[in-house]
């Protein structure tokens, strides 16, 4: 099963329950062999994924995996939604599964809901 294809390890149907006002890092785990591909983030708007331009991104290296990180500093209520990362590798575009951010606006929440409450959304 090991190959030198680029792989993006965002899990299908994954989600993150986060709060407006907090910092958050959205990670795209990337496996590559020789040359690190160019990776971008986009946000889903219906069936279209709109590329995120001018956002703070960074790379992190861990053992045999790299992570392309989208920084939220801080999280805004408008950040709620689904995101996807894409890699440009040998002029082919490889897309990840989408991952969803559930943003709770702390101004409208009397107390922070539990993880179970968030998961039941």
């Amino acid at each position: 099963k090991e190959s030198c294809d680029v792989q993006l390890y965002i899990k299908r149907q994954s989600y993150h329950s986060i709060f407006a006002g907090d910092p958050f890092k959205l990670e795209c785990p990337v496996k590559y062999c020789a040359h690190r591909p160019q990776v971008t983030w986009c946000k889903l708007n219906g069936t279209t994924c709109v590329k995120l331009e001018g956002r703070h991104t960074s790379w992190k290296q861990e053992k045999n995996l790299s992570f392309f990180i989208l920084h939220f500093e801080p999280v805004l209520p408008s950040d709620n939604g689904s995101y996807r990362c894409s890699a440009n590798f040998l002029s082919a575009i490889i897309e990840s599964h989408s991952t969803t951010l559930y943003v709770t606006d702390v101004k409208s929440a009397s107390e922070r809901p539990s993880k179970d409450e968030m998961a039941s959304r």
């Epitope: 993006l8 149907q13 994954s14 785990p29 990840s96 993880k115």
Partner: antibody, heavy 121, light 112 residues
Framework: EVQLQQSVAELVRPGASVKLSCTAS????????MYWVKQRPEQGLEWIGR????????KYAPKFQGKATITADTSSNTAYLQLSSLTSEDTAIYYC??????????????WGQGTTLTVSS | DVVMTQTPLTLSVTIGQPASISCKSS???????????LNWLLQRPGQSPKRLIY???KLDSGVPDRFTGSGSGTDFTLKISRVEAEDLGVYYC?????????FGGGTKLEIK
């Protein structure tokens, strides 16, 4: 080589709780979903739920909500299934399985050998 | 929940002959990402299940090419071109498109 190690059998009294474990070797469970499946004697398979060990997020089949609690410990590469208020209906084989993701499609999955749970006084 | 209906319940086949199992879902398994998360599992006697096919037609590593998966929407088929003794066991279809994931009732393949 990926392996999932489960205890072979558990005998528990009605009304009690039990915590079944599933330890993965040859793979970091953070890159996977770990899920649990129930098989009653001479019957089919039922999906209980799953955990994303990277962040602890869980999803349960409605039938098992309140009955099952899935947790994971990434330091020991182990997933757990806790079953509460046990009755004879919970007598079954419980399989853990690991679903590993690549770019935009399921990659492969591995199943443990199953733990036979017997609820009896 | 999505109901997965498998037919037949039991299949008795002579070694070397073909076999076919049908699986119908109560709603379409085509996901919004354009993929169909329909798997086939084999549970040999006394063993844990093992996935043979995923995404309708992709063979898992080590699965012989005498196994073929096909179908779309709500109708799916697993075919074995020439049954061998090691193929006996219970076959399950399994959908991962909709929450919660659900399994078919199983088809027992017996060797005549």
């Amino acid at each position: 080589e990926v392996q999932l190690q489960q205890s072979v059998a558990e005998l528990v009294r009605p009304g009690a709780s039990v915590k079944l474990s599933c330890t993965a070797s040859g793979f970091n469970i953070k890159n996977t979903y770990m899920y649990w499946v129930k098989q009653r004697p001479e019957q089919g398979l039922e999906w209980i739920g799953r955990i994303d060990p990277a962040n602890g997020n869980t999803k349960y089949a409605p039938k098992f909500q309140g009955k099952a609690t899935i947790t994971a410990d990434t330091s020991s590469n182990t997933a757990y299934l806790q079953l509460s208020s046990l009755t004879s209906e919970d007598t079954a084989i419980y399989y853990c399985a690991l679903l590993y993701y690549g770019s935009s499609y399921d990659y492969f999955d591995y199943w443990g050998q199953g733990t036979t749970l017997t609820v009896s006084s | 929940d999505v109901v997965m209906t498998q037919t037949p319940l039991t299949l008795s086949v002579t070694i070397g002959q073909p076999a076919s199992i049908s699986c119908k879902s109560s709603q379409s398994l085509l996901d919004s990402d354009g993929k169909t998360y329909l798997n086939w599992l084999l549970q040999r006697p006394g063993q844990s299940p093992k996935r043979l096919i995923y995404l309708v037609s992709k063979l898992d590593s080590g699965v012989p090419d005498r196994f073929t998966g096909s179908g779309s929407g709500t109708d799916f088929t697993l075919k074995i071109s020439r049954v061998e003794a090691e193929d006996l066991g219970v076959y399950y279809c399994w959908q991962g498109t909709h929450f919660p994931q659900t399994f078919g009732g199983g088809t027992k393949l017996e060797i005549k």
